[in-house]
Structure formats: C-alpha cells, structure tokens
C-alpha cells in the first residue's frame, strides 16, 4: 500500500534569464528511493540514481544543474521553459510517486501588478 506523499516547492513564476530551484520531498513512507526522474512534458531532464548518481540529459546540460539534494536548478530561463515539471520518485517496495510543479517564465518587462519574481 502506498502511504507516501510528495511535497513540492509549489508553482513558481520567474523572470526570463533568471534561475530557479525545483524541489520535491517524499514523506510518510519508509520506502527506499531508488531513483528520481525530472521530466518536463514528455522530455527527460535529469535522473538521480541512488547508486549511480546524477545524469543530466545532453540537451539540457548547459542550463540544468543537479541539486540541491534531489532537486534541480534551472538556469538562464526562457519563456519557452514555461510548463509543467514532474519529479518522479521510484521507490521500493511502494512503487512510483509523482509531484508536479508549474513554472511560468515572464519577460523581464512584464512585472505587472507588482509581482514578486523569483531570481535567487
């Protein structure tokens, strides 16, 4: 029986050119995390394997950095990065848990209504 829950950073609005951290946390289960996949729509961004460590997809190598922890740092954001990101936790014996984060990337000039944008 799958008892765990995934907590995420929550949805994020950020400025073009900036960087953000996507993070998920699996709680309420004693299952062992064997691998975490980070995906956007149908694209694999990165894998963190418990034994083999991190693998970043070649097409994202220049803009994606592993961590902190099991999270992922996206750099040099573009409007095209807007979309839903998935953290997929592969665990034993529970199976797969998925968290979802929507990232909205805005042109720097749009800062409408006094929005507070994330540029760590």
């Amino acid at each position: 029986m799958m008892t765990g829950t995934i907590e995420t950073t929550g949805n994020i609005s950020a400025e073009k050119g900036g960087s953000i951290i996507l993070q998920c946390h699996l709680s309420s289960t004693t299952a062992q995390v064997t691998q975490v996949n980070w995906e956007q729509q149908d694209q694999l961004l990165a894998i963190c394997n418990a034994d083999l460590g991190w693998h970043i997809s070649p097409s994202f190598k220049d803009r994606v950095a592993p961590g902190p922890g099991l999270g992922l740092t996206l750099q040099s954001l573009t409007v095209n990065d807007t979309g839903e990101y998935f953290c997929i936790y592969h665990t034993y014996p529970d199976g797969t848990y998925t968290g979802r984060i929507f990232l909205e990337v805005l042109e720097s000039s749009v800062a409408e209504h006094g929005a507070r944008f994330q540029i760590p």
């Epitope: 949805n11 994020i12 839903e84």
Partner: antibody, heavy 119, light 112 residues
C-alpha cells in the same frame, strides 16, 4: 479591451465527444495561459487545466485526464477544449479564463458555454 | 489535492454591513520562494465569475476598496466593509500554488 468569446450552448448525446472554443482578443495572446473551469449544478467550480499558447505547454487536473484535451490555434487566437466520452456528469457550464501573469489567478473570463448531455 | 474550505456557506446580510469570509487550505499556500497564490472571485447570477483579489491582498483593477484580503499560510480572509446591492452573489477562493489549482466550495452572500 480583453475579451474572451466562447462558442454557444451544446446538447449532446451520451458517449459523444465535443469541442468548445474560446477566441481571445485585446491582448498579446501567446503571452498568457488560458485556463478552463467547470461549474456543475450552478455551484462548484473545478479547474480542468491550462495551456500556454507560446509553446503549447499544458497542465491538467488529473481528475480530468482522458476526459478533457486542451489545444490552441495561434493563428486565430483561439483555444479549444475537447470533452470525450460524455456522460451526464459532464453536464455543466464551462468557462475559459486568462491567467494573471505572475500570480496564478484568473483575471478575465469568457461568458461560459453550457453543455447538456442527454439522450 | 489541496482542499479549500470556505466558511460560512451562506451569509445573510443587510446593506451597509461589514462581513468576513474565511478560506482555509489543507496545506500551506506559500511556495518555496515565499509567494502565496490565493485569489478571490465574485460570481453573480447570469454573469461570469470575476476576479476581486489576487496574491492574498492585491485588489484587481476596478475593484472597490471596500474589498480587502488578508492571511498567510493556510488561513485567508476576504472582508467587505460596507455591503452594497451589487455585492450579492457567490464568493470563491482559489489556490494556484499547488497542482491542480483548487477552488473553495463557495459562500453565498444574500440579503436577510
């Protein structure tokens, strides 16, 4: 002036599929998400999902995965939501609503499309 | 999914009254950068819903200053300082911090 014009009311048979349209005007269409909201029984509001026309990225309420498909035609500034395998539970008013940039809120709404599923 | 609980379900008022509507979320609506995506809407009969408040406390353009929003974390409040006839209808809160976005069950503001 921002305007969202939705297609007219629909009466459809159970098991059928249908597509609702939402034509946007008065703003830069590709720069804002377009969301879809369901109102059942004149009360409950449910977020079905969104699309970002710039890159056609979508996000769905998983409750409606396999039920709703959101698409966009950038050439006509129109967003579509297709509803599949309709049942009486899908009878509702469906709204399109523009996303407020930077705040994950809904700032402008269409007039709503009433969908009745009945044999 | 995040559950949004609105109270009261019904709010009988007289014109000129001050009222508060509460919205509680089943988990914090602050994202990891400290931003909270909580908004309020009024849905009048025969019309589409319209935005009143976004980002907890920001009034949308054209919304009278008798409407105000406050709160943090999991507890949020919409206050209307002096009820007018055009304020009657259904009020909804919406959280956009977590996927999927979720609405409260609504509060009906009606005349006594």
């Amino acid at each position: 002036e921002v305007q969202l014009q939705q297609s007219g009311p629909e009466l459809v048979k159970p098991g059928a599929s249908m597509k609702i349209s939402c034509k946007a005007s008065g703003y830069s269409f590709t720069g804002y998400t377009m969301n879809w909201v369901k109102q059942s029984h004149g009360k409950n509001l449910e977020w079905l999902g969104l699309i970002f026309p710039y890159n056609s990225a979508t996000s769905y309420n998983q409750k409606f995965t396999g039920k709703a498909t959101i698409t966009v035609d950038k050439s006509s500034n129109t967003t579509y939501m297709e509803l599949l395998s309709l049942t009486s539970e899908d009878s509702a008013v469906y709204y399109c609503a523009r996303g407020l940039r930077g705040f994950f809120a809904l700032d402008y709404w269409g007039q709503g499309t009433s969908v009745t599923v009945s044999s | 999914d995040v559950v949004m609980t609105q109270t009261p379900l019904s709010l009988p008022v007289s014109f000129g009254d001050q009222v508060s509507i509460s919205c509680r979320s089943s988990q914090s609506l602050a994202n990891s950068y400290g931003n909270t995506y909580l908004s309020w809407y009024l849905h009048k009969p025969g019309q589409s819903p319209h935005l009143l408040i976004y980002g907890i406390s920001n009034r949308f353009s054209g919304v009278p200053d008798r409407f105000s929003g406050s709160g943090s974390g999991t507890d949020f409040t919409l206050k209307i300082s002096t009820i007018k006839p055009e304020d009657l209808g259904m009020y909804y809160c919406l959280q956009g911090t977590h996927q999927p976005w979720t609405f409260g069950g609504g509060t009906k503001l009606e005349i006594k």
